[in-house]
């Protein structure tokens, strides 16, 4: 009852003449276990005798020993674990049909078929590739063999045109009661070379001899694979000759389906086969020429060719790297002019004259001057001809105004307090001339452009200068103005002595004076009104208190003259000229108040006085005035008085006084 | 010109997980395979596995479990996962890059990075 | 997976000898490849396809075989071709590389 039994196996096994074969093999039996097993070649059921009759390559006994049997065949199952896989090695062509599996169980007996194929030679491996192959795209390469055994080592290896392929392959071997199988996956990324080329998968044995090989050709599908072709097969041409391009599809799988061509990357105009005839070619058409051609598997461009229409020189312009361009800067001109080939020649000219020793296309003024601006033009010349020269670029050459000078324009002499015009002028100047600079810096009026006027002009107004600018300011020399002026700083100075004037000094006056223009002076010296001497220098032998007073001294010029503040001369000089005086007169009478009053002469004033008597006996009084209070007729008597300050002391005569007697007195008489 | 570079932790504990960066210059991950490579210190090579142009990859059989391979073509760099690290895992990684996009023999090395595997 | 075996493990020679160092794979390869490491450098391609000098290295270094057996020979040994040389395969995955030979100075 086949409900009973559950036995897997591959079904079919295949191998070859002298090969061996692995057959995997599990079983499960419902009821019971399996006591008997026995392996049939062919096995056919005798109805008559109710049993199954056949070549008996193996046969378990009852005990589970195995028999000596037939040493090829192997039983590697056993009872324990449900196996009953076997193995037969080596294997034989006749070895080819059913092998029946006969398992019997205290209550059940069953016959399971294997089939069993062995060719007489190897038979080849299968080759599975992908539906498509698509360049540059990984696949997987798959080489099948329905064969593994563990008695009987092979290998498949892959080869490309005969030759071994470099990528490494993964083998998988399969000995499971589901399949048998050994099997070699390659990753390949093809690429449109590969295309129609063939792969193989060979089986080698173990000592690397190739048994059987399966051949597939490559149909790997690419874009179209292109080159160019130019003919003439020059791409520099001239203007007017005509071109053909072609495009040539090396390759394409599938087949090409469209065609157009591509001038600078852009698609050109209904050309849409692979030649491309340019007739009487100009020099817009030269260019990066290629062709794209698209199949299924998309498009495809070629190389680009550079097609040259070579051309005489174009009418030429003159770029120049800066203008206007300032003084001392340096100057790039080139010279422009379309053609092929480049120019070999160029002929400069400046303001229509040609420039010497000028032949490349461009050249440098390092330093730039005036002189150099002007209209700049050139011709270009190459193997074609001279091109027509253009119409040329001006340079303009800016610098600061040139040669800046200054004018005084009113008569000379100038004298302080005029009004003085200063005009400031300028040789050239480029840009012209907007503002002017002067210096030193004053609210000085500028009536015009360049013009200054200076009134009231100062004695020390000594150099002025000015600056002429444009852009730049350019400064004149300094011009000296040469303001006359009368004497200046006129003043007294004692020259000596040093210390104060004692009476009897010698004493000398300087007078001084700080500047004068012109240099020439005289000299005058003046006291009270009085002219003294027309020296710089006043002196004094033996100064006396009578030449103190007030001093002057006077510079003149020829422009005019100076006098100095007055100047104090004071002498210094002990008391002198005492006297002593009496308000009330020489005659007194007792009783009365007597005063005496000493008179001096002195430089400084005196600080001290003192009074004697007609016997120089000394009073005690030391002021100026002697005050006698009651006096007394005992008090008659010359008396004299003395006089102190810091230079010395001076005394004056005897003045008598007299003291006469009252009535009052003489009537008590 | 072709330049690798690997990028890893140095120091992991045993269990944990590794992930190493290999940085690429000077071509296009969509057409050549990366592999990588490792050596136990004073040890020979081991194969680790590969991926390729494609995306697809290849692992060496006895570590399969543990390992996965991307990368991400834009950055240009191709990435290292292995799980449950033990210490014989310890060793100097390599990225590696075949001479030609269909050849065998590794022309590029990285410098590579040493993966100490310590508690 | 391809099992490489690199013999001998360490070799000793002077300058000038002629060094051949031996790979065996464990099943057919159809490519071999030879690096060389120094230490603390990163291994670098000497040969590929079997018998290809890669960029650089110099003309003393050569490789051959086929199948199971592969060799690399440096003609006249020199001190800065001292470091350790290890095969790799890239017939099937896993790539698997020899456990290398150490190669030293006298």
């Known amino acids: 009852d086949s409900s009973k039994w559950n036995i897997e196996h591959p079904g079919t096994i295949y191998a070859w003449e002298g090969a061996c074969v692995w057959v995997p093999c599990t079983y499960r039996v419902l009821d019971g276990a399996l006591e008997t097993f026995i392996l049939f070649h062919n096995p056919e059921y005798n109805q008559n005798m109710s049993k199954f009759e056949g070549t008996r390559l193996y046969e378990s006994t009852k005990d589970g020993k195995l028999p000596s049997g037939q040493k090829r065949v192997q039983f590697l199952g056993n009872k324990i674990n449900n196996n009953c896989t076997l193995s037969i090695h080596p294997v034989h062509v006749n070895d080819s049909g059913q092998l029946g599996l006969r398992m019997v169980s205290k209550t059940e007996k069953w016959m399971e078929r294997i089939h069993l194929n062995v060719s007489e030679r190897p038979f080849p491996p299968r080759i599975q590739l992908p539906p498509k192959l698509q360049e540059s795209q990984e696949v997987t390469l798959t080489c099948l063999l329905n064969f593994s055994c563990y008695g009987y080592q092979i290998q498949l290896q892959w080869l490309l045109e005969g030759v071994p392929m470099r990528q490494a392959a993964v083998t998988l071997t399969s000995l499971s009661t589901k399949s048998v199988f050994t099997r070699s996956e390659l990753k390949f990324s093809p690429q449109w070379s590969h295309h129609g080329k063939i792969v193989t998968c060979e089986l080698h044995d173990v000592d690397g001899k190739v048994l059987s090989e399966d051949m597939v050709q490559l149909n790997v599908k690419h874009t179209p694979k292109l080159t160019i072709e130019v003919t003439p097969n020059e791409t520099t041409v001239r203007k007017g000759d005509s071109v053909t391009m072609t495009c040539k599809v090396n390759s394409s799988n599938p087949e090409y389906t469209t065609v157009s061509w591509l001038k600078d990357g852009i698609p050109l105009k209904e050309q849409n086969t692979l030649m491309l005839t340019l007739h009487k070619v100009t020099k817009s058409q030269s260019g990066r020429y290629c062709c794209r051609v698209s199949n299924d598997v998309g498009p495809a461009t070629s190389e680009k060719v550079f097609l040259q229409v070579q051309y005489a020189p174009e009418s030429s312009r003159v770029q120049i790297s800066q203008s206007p361009a300032v003084e001392g800067s340096e100057v790039n001109f080139l010279c422009i002019s379309p053609a092929n080939p480049l120019p070999t020649n160029y002929t400069w000219y400046h303001n229509g004259k040609e420039v010497q020793g000028r032949t490349e296309k461009q050249f440098q003024i390092q330093k730039i001057l005036p002189w150099h601006a002007g209209t700049y033009s050139c011709e270009a010349e190459n193997i074609l001809g001279i091109g027509e020269r253009g119409p040329g670029t001006e340079l303009d050459v800016q610098y600061p105004p040139k040669k800046v000078t200054m004018v005084i324009e009113n008569p000379t002499p100038i004298r302080e307090g005029d009004t003085v015009t200063l005009s400031c002028n300028y040789s050239s100047s480029n840009p012209i001339v907007n503002h002017y600079e002067w210096r030193p810096r004053g609210a000085w009026e500028e009536p015009s452009l360049g013009v200054l006027k200076i009134q009231n002009i100062g004695w020390n107004n000594t150099a002025v200068a000015c600056a002429a600018c444009n852009n730049w300011c350019s400064w004149a020399s300094p011009v000296t103005l040469n303001v006359l002026y009368a004497p200046r700083g006129v003043r007294v100075r004692k020259i000596k002595p040093l210390s104060e004037i004692h009476s009897g000094n010698s004493v000398s006056l300087q007078c001084d004076f700080s500047s004068s223009h012109p240099k020439e002076v005289q000299f005058f010296w003046e006291k009270n009104g009085s002219l003294l001497g027309k020296e710089s220098q006043l002196n004094f032998d033996s100064i006396s208190p009578e030449d103190a007073g007030s001093y002057s001294c006077w510079v003149n010029n020829s422009i005019g003259q100076t006098a100095s503040k007055a100047w104090t001369l004071e002498v210094l000089y002990a008391p002198r000229r005492l006297r002593v005086s009496m308000s009330q007169g020489n005659q007194v009478m007792e009783g009365k108040t007597a005063t005496l009053i000493c008179e001096s002469d002195a430089n400084p004033p005196v600080y001290s006085y003192a009074w004697f008597d007609w016997n120089n006996q000394s009073l005690p009084y030391s002021g100026r005035m002697l005050r006698l209070e009651p006096v007394k007729v005992q008090h008659s008597g010359a008396y004299w008085c003395q006089g102190t300050n810091r230079v010395g002391k001076g005394h004056s005569p005897l003045i008598t006084l007299t003291v006469y007697y009252s009535p009052q007195t003489i009537g008590r008489r | 010109q072709v330049q690798l570079k690997e990028s890893g932790p140095g120091l992991v504990a045993p269990s944990q997980s590794l992930s190493i960066t290999c940085t690429v210059s000077?071509?296009?991950?969509?057409?050549?395979?990366v592999h990588w490579v490792r050596q136990p210190p004073g040890k020979g090579l081991e194969w680790l596995g590969m991926i390729w142009g494609g995306g697809s990859t290849d692992y060496n059989s006895a570590l399969k479990s543990r390992l996965s391979i991307s990368k991400d073509n834009s950055k240009s760099q191709v990435f290292l996962k292995m799980n449950s690290l033990q210490t014989d895992d310890t060793a100097m990684y390599y990225c590696a890059r075949p001479h030609d996009f269909d050849a065998g023999g590794f022309a590029y090395w990285g410098q590579g990075t040493l993966v100490t595997v310590s508690a | 997976q391809i099992v490489l075996t690199q013999s001998p493990a360490i070799l000793s020679t002077s300058p000038g000898e002629k060094v051949t160092m031996t790979c065996s794979a464990s099943?057919?390869?159809?490519?071999m490849y030879w690096y060389q490491q120094k230490p603390g450098s990163s291994p670098r391609l000497l040969i590929y396809d079997t018998s290809n000098l890669a960029s650089g290295v110099p003309v003393r270094f050569s490789g051959s075989g086929s199948g199971t057996s592969y060799s690399l020979t440096i003609s006249r040994m020199e001190a800065e071709d001292a470091a350790t040389y290890y095969c790799q395969q890239w017939t099937s995955y896993p790539l698997t590389f020899g456990a290398g030979t150490k190669l030293e100075l006298k």
């Open positions: 099943s057919r390869v159809n490519y």
């Open positions: 000077g071509f296009s991950l969509s057409r050549y395979t």
